[in-house]
């Protein structure tokens, strides 16, 4: 074998070698980048794991802070039982009396009877403050609502409920005045105003009892 | 200030019809009692028909059958409709109406000013 040629040989030898060396080269920083990729993984994942367990942490003290409050909320609760609100849920407490605003319309007796189901009888205005309140209550609406005042005929005296005189200096009663229905004539409050009608048209109504302010 | 404005009033044939309206404006609580009154020739003025506030009516015993009062709540209007008619429902017709302007005011009762109505042939 010529020099030559084995001059050839190791140059192709050496460049077998530089490629395989790169080959390695690159496998190595492959496997590094790979490495350095899964490390950070790890440690996001890591990270990770702390937040979720630092806030399961917080989560867990806010649900103990909760039942506690809990707790002190069922016992203020069964404190509280023991004490008597002046008015049934969704009436209005006024002074002596509660409000119940009715959500139908009915004829006066019906309405009446609405009332008495309920302990209560059809609104009554003993004075010029209870007066004012009501006005003040249905101010804003343009609804008639049947109170407790009626009559048999023109020739009789408005009565309330009680059979108690309507008192005159509390306010007039218009509308209807002169006329006779078989029913009777009924008195409505409209706006702060008082209409007498025929006591079997409907109308919503006012139902009043006195306030509960005995003290425990 | 409160206004009752009448329309509808005119010439007619006895047997024949007319429709009167009126209608209330200005600013007020409440309206009680709407109708109408009419004043014939040399005479008093007088009860025609009128409606309450929850609907009931009441006619003068004359019109009954052949007046028809009703009344639009929401838009503060009465009407009346006048049929077979006859020469002596010849007359100023009036609209009425109780208004509540203020609770603690005296002043109720408003009128139109009147709307001819005659019944000839």
């Known amino acids: 074998m010529q020099l030559s040629q084995v001059s050839d040989l190791l140059t192709q030898e050496q460049a077998n070698l530089t490629h395989q060396k790169k080959k390695l080269e690159g496998q190595i920083s492959a496997r590094q980048q790979a490495e350095e990729a899964s490390q950070e993984s790890e440690n996001e994942l890591k990270e990770m794991i702390e937040t979720l367990a630092r806030k399961l942490n917080e989560k867990s003290k806010e649900q103990m802070e909760l039942h506690h409050q809990n707790l002190n909320l069922q016992e203020t609760l069964k404190r509280v039982a023991n004490c008597s609100a002046p008015c049934p849920q969704d009436w209005i407490w006024h002074g002596e009396n509660c409000y119940l605003f009715s959500s139908g319309s009915f004829n006066w007796e019906k309405s009446q009877e609405k009332c008495l189901s309920l302990d209560a009888k059809l609104l009554k205005i003993n004075s010029t403050a209870d007066l004012d309140f009501i006005q003040q209550a249905i101010s804003y609406s343009s609804f008639p609502f049947w109170m407790g005042l009626s009559r048999r005929n023109p020739s009789y005296p408005w009565l309330w409920e009680d059979g108690s005189p309507l008192m005159p200096h509390l306010f007039r009663v218009r509308g209807a005045v002169s006329q006779t229905y078989p029913s009777g004539t009924c008195a409505y409050i409209q706006r702060g105003a008082v209409y007498a009608e025929n006591c079997i048209l409907a109308a919503f109504s006012i139902c009043q009892k006195k306030a509960n302010l005995r003290a425990q | 200030e409160v206004q009752l404005v009448e329309s509808g009033g005119g010439l007619v044939q006895p047997g024949g019809s007319l429709r009167l309206s009126c209608a209330a404006y200005?600013?007020?609580?409440?309206?009680?009692?709407m109708g109408w009154y009419r004043q014939p020739p040399g005479n008093q003025r007088e009860l025609v028909a009128v409606?309450?506030?929850?609907?009931?009516?009441n006619y003068a015993e004359s019109v009954k059958g052949r007046f028809t009062i009703s009344r639009d709540n929401a838009k503060n209007t009465v009407s009346l409709q006048m049929n077979s008619l006859k020469p002596e429902d010849t007359a100023v017709y009036y609209c009425?109406?109780?208004?509540?302007?203020?609770?603690?005011?005296?002043?109720?009762?408003?009128w139109g000013q009147g709307t001819q109505v005659t019944v000839s042939s």
């Open positions: 409606t309450y506030g929850l609907g009931s009516t």
């Open positions: 009425y109406a109780e208004i509540d302007t203020d609770p603690r005011s005296g002043e109720w009762d408003y």
């Open positions: 200005g600013s007020f609580f409440s309206i009680g009692t």
